[in-house]
């Protein structure tokens, strides 16, 4: 029986050209996290495996950094980065948990409320 829940940063906004951290947290389960996949719509961005560590998709290597923790840092944001992001937790013995984050990348003048998600 799957008892866990995924907590995410929810709907967030950030400035064009800036950076942002995508974070998910799995709670309320003792299941072992074996792997976390990060996806943007229909694209695999990165994988963090308990044994193998991080794999960043080559096409995103310049703008995606692993961490902190099981999270993902997106850099040099563009308007095209706006959209849904998914963290997919593969666990044993529970199975798969999925969290969703919606990121809106705005021109700097309108992204003030997203500033607290920025990396200094």
């Amino acid at each position: 029986m799957m008892t866990g829940t995924i907590e995410t940063t929810g709907n967030i906004s950030a400035e064009k050209g800036g950076s942002i951290i995508l974070q998910c947290h799995l709670s309320s389960t003792t299941a072992q996290v074996t792997q976390v996949n990060w996806e943007q719509q229909d694209q695999l961005l990165a994988i963090c495996n308990a044994d193998l560590g991080w794999h960043i998709s080559p096409s995103f290597k310049d703008r995606v950094a692993p961490g902190p923790g099981l999270g993902l840092t997106l850099q040099s944001l563009t308007v095209n980065d706006t959209g849904e992001y998914f963290c997919i937790y593969h666990t044993y013995p529970d199975g798969t948990y999925t969290g969703r984050i919606f990121l809106e990348v705005l021109e700097s003048s309108v992204a003030e409320h997203g500033a607290r998600f920025q990396i200094p």
Epitope: L44, D51, L52, P93
Partner: antibody
Framework: EVQLLESGGGLVQPGGSLRLSCAAS????????MHWVRQAPGKGLEWVSG????????SYADSVKGRFTISRDNSKNTLYLQMNSLRAEDTAVYYC???????????WGQGTLVTVSS | DIQMTQSPSSLSASVGDRVTITCRAS??????LNWYQQKPGKAPKLLIY???SLQSGVPSRFSGSGSGTDFTLTISSLQPEDFATYYC?????????FGGGTKVEIK
């Protein structure tokens, strides 16, 4: 250098059993998921079974479920496929493959031929 | 189960030709799509993983694209050693499934 070497294939009668082995070297075997894939003579590739790095999670194709068992011994760097109640349609070359991140098979063995015939 | 439909099943081409092979999934598989090359009597070889990532050591004339349900393998300039059978494979969910293969033959 990554190497995967299958063994244990051969001729067996319908209803019989075989155990295939895949000896791994050149990498940290215990860190990788491993899969078995087969190919019937003149046919395409068919996934058979997969196992997680620690052996805790396994999955099977419907065509072999209940008859085949995948396992691994990380202390011996070896992957196994126990095949019971073999049928003529199980005749194929069986490949083991290393599957990083459980997503792609980056190294394959040379294969071992299993022939089920009376 | 997710069905993978590959086309064409075979094609004839000449050295230097641009070759395109397509693969369609019966449901969205994000970018969990891999391409393999197989020569007679040999094990498959990974060319492209996660739809568009070139495996280390594979020539850059091979490229992959697509996401969701429709994917393409392109060989920009066919070389003599590229005559082989190519398979797509989804790793989105088990059971993992392969396309039926595309045999690339010399014209």
């Amino acid at each position: 250098e990554v190497q995967l070497l299958e063994s244990g294939g051969g001729l067996v009668q319908p209803g019989g059993s075989l155990r295939l082995s895949c000896a791994a070297s050149g990498f940290t075997f215990s860190s990788y998921a491993m899969h078995w894939v087969r190919q019937a003579p003149g046919k395409g590739l068919e996934w058979v079974s997969g196992i997680s790095s620690n052996g805790g999670s396994t999955s099977y194709a419907d065509s072999v479920k209940g008859r085949f068992t995948i396992s691994r011994d990380n202390s011996k760097n070896t992957l196994y496929l126990q095949m019971n109640s073999l049928r003529a349609e199980d005749t194929a070359v069986y490949y083991c493959a290393r599957v990083p991140y459980s997503v792609w098979a980056d190294y394959w063995g040379q294969g071992t031929l299993v022939t089920v015939s009376s | 189960d997710i069905q993978m439909t590959q086309s064409p099943s075979s094609l004839s081409a000449s050295v230097g030709d641009r070759v395109t092979i397509t693969c369609r999934a019966s449901q969205s598989i994000s970018s969990y799509l891999n391409w393999y090359q197989q020569k007679p009597g040999k094990a498959p070889k990974l060319l492209i993983y996660a739809a568009s990532s070139l495996q280390s050591g594979v020539p850059s004339r091979f490229s992959g694209s697509g996401s969701g349900t429709d994917f393409t393998l392109t060989i920009s300039s066919l070389q003599p050693e590229d005559f082989a059978t190519y398979y797509c494979q989804q790793s989105y969910s088990t059971p993992l499934t392969f396309g039926g293969g595309t045999k690339v033959e010399i014209k």
